[in-house]
């Protein structure tokens, strides 16, 4: 503000994540996720809020179903623009199985390694997006504990679309996905009515991720 109380420069509230984080997004790519472009739209809206680069935030993406695919590593791209282009091109791998424990464990053991771009001393964040109970849920408790031991902050998102389409109870599913989220659960767990609604949680999810380095 000038001596005459005129606004000379204004700084917009910080909406971007301009801090150092290593974020791995773990996507359920099984057939029941429909339509897939709702997932890529969600990725686009989330990633465009991030200041991505080798000295800022890094993002890697893992897709799982019956098995796991590294879509791209943390150190693959060095700008938000590059990551946005790559994320848009991610195709749904399909399959009927939802091996969520395998997806999370692979992200922990492989995606968060220095070989794939993870940086020492940088906070690790995992975002898990799924629409069904895991077929390997007997492994989940240990897998989550392993993440906890490695200080990986976890945000989990339950898509209720396939349950609502089939008029099925979501209770057991929601409990499972809540168990994946870090404490406090209410700050780390989200659920959406269907895939189209994923974009509605981007702002809040982004703010909570960014708050980790506030």
């Amino acid at each position: 503000v000038s001596p005459t109380f005129q606004v000379v420069n204004s700084i917009a509230p910080v909406q971007e994540c301009s801090t150092q984080l290593d974020i791995v997004i773990v996507l359920d790519g099984s057939n029941s996720i429909y339509p897939w472009d709702s997932v890529t739209a969600f990725l686009n809206d989330l990633l465009e809020r991030m200041d991505i680069g080798p000295k800022q935030t890094q993002v890697g993406i893992v897709q799982y179903g019956a098995n796991v695919t590294h879509e791209f590593n943390l150190n693959k791209y060095s700008s938000t623009e590059e990551v946005l282009v790559a994320a848009k091109k991610i195709v749904q791998r399909g399959g009927r199985q939802t091996m969520t424990a395998l997806g999370i464990d692979t992200a922990r053991k492989e995606a968060f390694t220095e070989a794939r771009g993870a940086r020492r001393g940088v906070k690790k964040v995992m975002v898990i997006v799924t629409d069904g109970e895991s077929h390997d849920n007997h492994r989940l408790k240990k897998v989550i504990q392993d993440c906890e031991d490695e200080n990986i902050q976890r945000f989990s998102i339950a898509i209720l679309g396939s349950y609502n389409r089939g008029n099925l109870s979501t209770e057991k599913f929601v409990e499972e996905i809540k168990s994946i989220a870090s404490e406090p659960t209410e700050k780390h767990f989200f659920n959406v009515s269907d895939e189209l609604a994923l974009v509605t949680i981007v702002k809040t999810l982004g703010e909570r991720i960014f708050a980790l380095e506030a």
């Epitope: 099984s30 057939n31 029941s32 429909y34 339509p35 897939w36 179903g65 019956a66 749904q92 791998r93 399909g94 399959g95 009927r96 396939s162 389409r165 089939g166 099925l168 269907d194 189209l196």
Partner: antibody, heavy 124, light 108 residues
């Protein structure tokens, strides 16, 4: 590149059996449902049934249940449509198409994003 | 079973004109699970639109879909010579797939 390649045209007599095929490539064939669609001469499209090649789970349209058999051989990424006894009214173009969506838990949904070139079956 | 009725049966238009195709369902289509396909003579159908309004990969933006519930519309903003074909709507919200009878867009 995703491709569905169907077997060639067939001319058959009433009462004969027939199996036509649809071979997928360019994607994980065992991970997507494949549907079959009939188009009678000069007419519209009719959904016949659908199969998941990964485990051969199959669903039929009530109109085609018992009239045809849908099967798959995942080792060669191929789905099949077969008749045990053809009728003149089976004369049509038959298309296979990949389902972007799912068919489990009693609920089916999704659109057909890639189609085969069609197999013309003539019964006379 | 949901019955889809397309209108008009035939649409006679000139290149450059706007085409509006209608698809009416006998009962509400859940989650707007409706697709549009284009079929040219001696060719397989091609996906244009899914979930009522989302354009399939590689489909020009002159094609747009709208609607929900029981009434859906496919609009071609400016007809190109290659757009003259038969168009089918299809619903997929009831554990089966049903198609409309088709609308033929022909050159006037």
């Amino acid at each position: 590149e995703v491709q569905l390649v169907q077997s060639g045209a067939e001319v058959k007599k009433p009462g004969e059996s027939l199996r036509i095929s649809c071979k997928g490539s360019g994607y994980s064939v065992t991970s997507y449902w494949i549907g079959w669609v009939r188009q009678m001469p000069g007419k519209g499209l009719e959904w016949m049934g659908i199969i998941y090649p990964g485990d051969s789970d199959t669903r039929y349209s009530p109109s085609f249940q018992g009239q045809v058999t849908i099967s798959a051989d995942k080792s060669i990424s191929t789905a099949y449509l077969q008749w045990s006894s053809l009728k003149a009214s089976d004369t049509a173009m038959y298309y296979c198409a990949r389902l972007q969506g799912d068919c489990s838990g009693g609920t089916c949904y999704g659109h057909f994003d890639y189609w085969g070139q069609g197999t013309l079956v003539t019964v006379s | 079973e949901i019955v889809l009725t397309q209108s008009p049966g035939t649409l006679s238009l000139s290149p450059g004109e706007r085409a509006t195709l209608s698809c009416r369902a006998s009962q509400s289509v859940s989650s707007s699970y409706l697709a549009w396909y284009q079929q040219k003579p001696a060719q397989a159908p091609r996906l244009l639109i899914y979930v009522a309004s989302r354009r399939a990969t590689g489909i020009p933006d002159r094609f747009s879909g709208s609607g929900s519930g029981t009434d859906f519309t496919l609009t071609i903003s400016r007809l190109e010579p290659e757009d003259f074909a038969v168009y089918y709507c299809q619903q997929y919200g009831t554990s089966s797939w049903t198609f409309g009878q088709g609308t033929t867009v022909e050159i006037k």
